[in-house]
Amino acid sequence: TIPPHVQKSVNNDMIVTDNNGAVKFPQLCKFCDVRFSTCDNQKSCMSNCSITSICEKPQEVCVAVWRKNDENITLETVCHDPKLPYHDFILEDAASPKCIMKEKKKPGETFFMCSCSSDECNDNIIFSEEYNTSNPDLLLVIFQ
């Protein structure tokens, strides 16, 4: 529980509590915004982002966005609130401990996005089919 001497301010999203008043720790995520990347045609890639940030709000999760167009490849690493869309997409896999990339439809580019909720989980982005969430073993891990 939040102790009596720690005030709980009303309508403040810096404090996230469960029904018993337990306080949620914030996520630690790679946070380099958009950087050029050499990650291409691989089962998985490291972000090569040297910045690990404390997410500002405890409800935020780690996100990675991989984009490829005719000119370049970029990788975006951020914290984001899964209740809000990112790049117009819902973060449907936010509870996953791993960042499993899923392709999204974006005109003029190849666009993959993943989200996850373990420390620095957006440092290792996974494209491989064997990690697809249709895998029941992965679902077991996610929802345990």
């Epitope: 529980t1 102790p3 009596p4 018993n20 337990a22 306080v23 949620k24 720790f25 630690l28 420390d119």
Partner: nanobody, 124 residues
Framework: EVQLLESGGGLVQPGGSLRLSCAAS???????RMWWVRQAPGKGLEWVS?????????YYADSVKGRFTISRDNSKNTLYLQMNSLRAEDTAVYYC?????????????????WGQGTLVTVSS
């Protein structure tokens, strides 16, 4: 019994420095990630900085990067926060908290995670 005892707060002028300490007892200090958390008057909790149990890897909120330095002395079971270039917006009660790596929520027991805090006031 788990105890976290913060000290070192006080009144300081803008641009000044303070060093906070958190003396920990009643648990295996080297197993826990430690945090400094602050609460400004009428505001919510802000997670200021964290340090891993071994290897001393550190993390900072954007609001304090380059000004605050977290450290720990595992032989003394003590956590520190060196605060430089203090600003009025750093005025808050500062708490230390412990987190088992991988753990998402603080336990229900109030004494398991919070000290009484130490007040830092930055004012001219």
């Amino acid at each position: 019994e788990v105890q976290l005892l913060e000290s070192g707060g006080g009144l300081v002028q803008p641009g000044g420095s303070l060093r906070l300490s958190c003396a920990a007892s009643g648990f295996t200090f080297t197993e826990y990630r430690m945090w400094w958390v602050r609460q400004a008057p009428g505001k919510g909790l802000e997670w200021v900085s964290a340090i891993e149990p071994i290897g001393n890897r550190t993390y900072y909120a954007d609001s304090v990067k380059g000004r605050f330095t977290i450290s720990r002395d595992n032989s003394k079971n003590t956590l520190y926060l060196q605060m430089n270039s203090l600003r009025a917006e750093d005025t808050a009660v500062y708490y230390c908290a412990k987190q088992m790596p991988g753990q998402k929520w603080m336990a229900k027991s109030r004494f398991d995670y919070w000290g009484q805090g130490t007040l830092v006031t930055v004012s001219s």
